[in-house]
């Protein structure tokens, strides 16, 4: 046959040679010819490639800079990045994790949805009625109203999304 | 198109030693392909002797080892063969190859 | 070393013959990736080799297709499929997989 046009599953064609490609973990030092293999060498220590590959240079792993509040959650390996999570109370900006922000709180009449992650930012949610928040937080859920009956008590002051019901005792002259 | 030209040869004395060269042109000897030496006795077949790598390492013939030496000057883009203690039996063309291309060859005659 | 014998040793023939050399390897010539080094070249009274087949069975730039190689492990050929005048030369197998690279004894193709 006259050399070939396409290639298999890792390799690749270069000079009408169907060459193979470097592992992940290695990169390419120099391309097969008629009568040599594909020569691949070992990435560095901080390198990496993650797929089978003819890069003639590795990737730097992700570096986890603590003054942007990063911090290493997965060290890398010649066939992975390192990946970065933030320091407690912190969260990332993107799906890359370039940078942290302080986690948001919820404000007085919202409370805590979801608490955050090293990767998403709080989620909060209006007190719904009979329910409230007096508090800016990271963490409070939105607290019940408290149940004047059950202490056989009774609503003296209306309950609002920032302030519990205020109790007290009923009145001795009704019948 | 990649061209090699050989020099050096000739008329050797026993236990002398000989310098071939190859200049090659049409394509870095340091950009890939290995580099080899092959010779040819007079009326006989093919031997390989060894190659010079484009990243300047080598390989022998075991049989050849302890007497021959591939080297390089990348500047003149040219490979060398250095062979030592000659006998009657290393007569020959010497050739040199990236083996799709090859020399015009040189004749090596060791005789007193 | 992976010993190469190619057979026949010489062999007469007519133009339009269809013409097969072989060559076998005393060691598996597949390497891990695969992949086989196996070539063949051409080689006519005083003139250096010509590559004509390269990696079992891939025809070099510029060989006509009358010229074909197969096999695998250790054992090929070269198929000429109708001989021409000017194929009457001898032919070389060639292993590049292991060091020391080897070469057959050589197939002389004579005109009958």
């Known amino acids: 046959p006259e050399p070939p046009t396409a290639c298999r599953e890792k390799q690749y064609l270069i000079n009408s040679q169907c060459c193979s490609l470097c592992q992940p973990g290695q990169k390419l030092v120099s391309d097969c010819t008629e009568f040599t293999e594909t020569e691949c060498l070992p990435c560095g220590e901080s390198e990496f490639l993650d797929t089978w590959n003819r890069e003639t240079h590795c990737h730097q792993h992700k570096y986890c800079d603590p003054n942007l509040g990063l911090r290493v959650q997965q060290k890398g390996t010649s066939e992975t990045d390192t990946i970065c999570t933030c320091e407690e109370g912190w969260h990332c900006t993107s799906e890359a994790c370039e940078s942290c922000v302080l986690h948001r709180s919820c404000s007085p009449g919202f409370g805590v949805k979801q608490i955050a992650t090293g990767v998403s930012d709080t989620i909060c949610e209006p007190c719904p009625v009979g329910f409230f928040s007096n508090v800016s937080s990271a963490f409070e859920k939105c607290h019940p109203w408290t149940s004047c009956e059950t202490k056989d008590l009774v609503v003296q002051q209306a309950g609002t999304n920032k302030t519990d019901v205020v109790c007290g005792p009923q009145d001795r002259l009704r019948a | 198109e990649v061209q090699l030209v050989e020099s050096g040869g000739g008329l050797v004395q026993p236990g002398g030693s000989l310098r071939l060269s190859c200049a090659a042109s049409?394509?870095?000897?340091?950009?890939?392909?290995?580099w080899n030496w092959v010779r040819q006795a007079p009326g006989k077949g093919l031997e390989w002797m060894g190659y010079i790598r484009y990243d300047g390492s080598n390989n022998y013939n075991p049989s050849l080892k302890n007497r021959i030496t591939i080297s390089r000057d990348t500047s003149k883009n040219t490979f060398y063969l250095q062979m030592n203690s000659l006998r009657a039996e290393d007569t020959a063309v010497y050739y040199c190859?990236?083996?799709?291309?090859w020399g015009q060859g040189t004749l090596v005659t060791v005789s007193s | 070393d992976a010993q190469m014998t190619q057979s026949p040793s010489s062999l007469s023939a007519s133009v339009g013959d269809r013409v097969t050399i072989t060559c076998r390897s005393s060691q598996s010539l597949e390497n891990t990736n695969g992949n086989t080094f196996l070539n063949w070249f051409q080689q006519k009274p005083g003139k250096a080799p010509k590559l004509l087949i390269y990696?079992?069975?891939n025809r070099f730039s510029g060989v006509p297709s009358r010229f074909s190689g197969s096999g695998s492990g250790t054992d090929f050929t070269l198929t000429i499929s109708s001989l021409q005048p000017e194929d009457f030369a001898t032919y070389y197998c060639?292993?590049?997989?292991?060091?020391?690279?080897?070469f057959g004894q050589g197939t002389k193709l004579e005109i009958k």
């Open positions: 060639l292993q590049v997989t292991h060091v020391p690279f080897t």
């Open positions: 049409g394509y870095s000897i340091t950009s890939n392909y290995y």
């Open positions: 190859a990236r083996l799709d291309y």
């Open positions: 990696r079992v069975s």
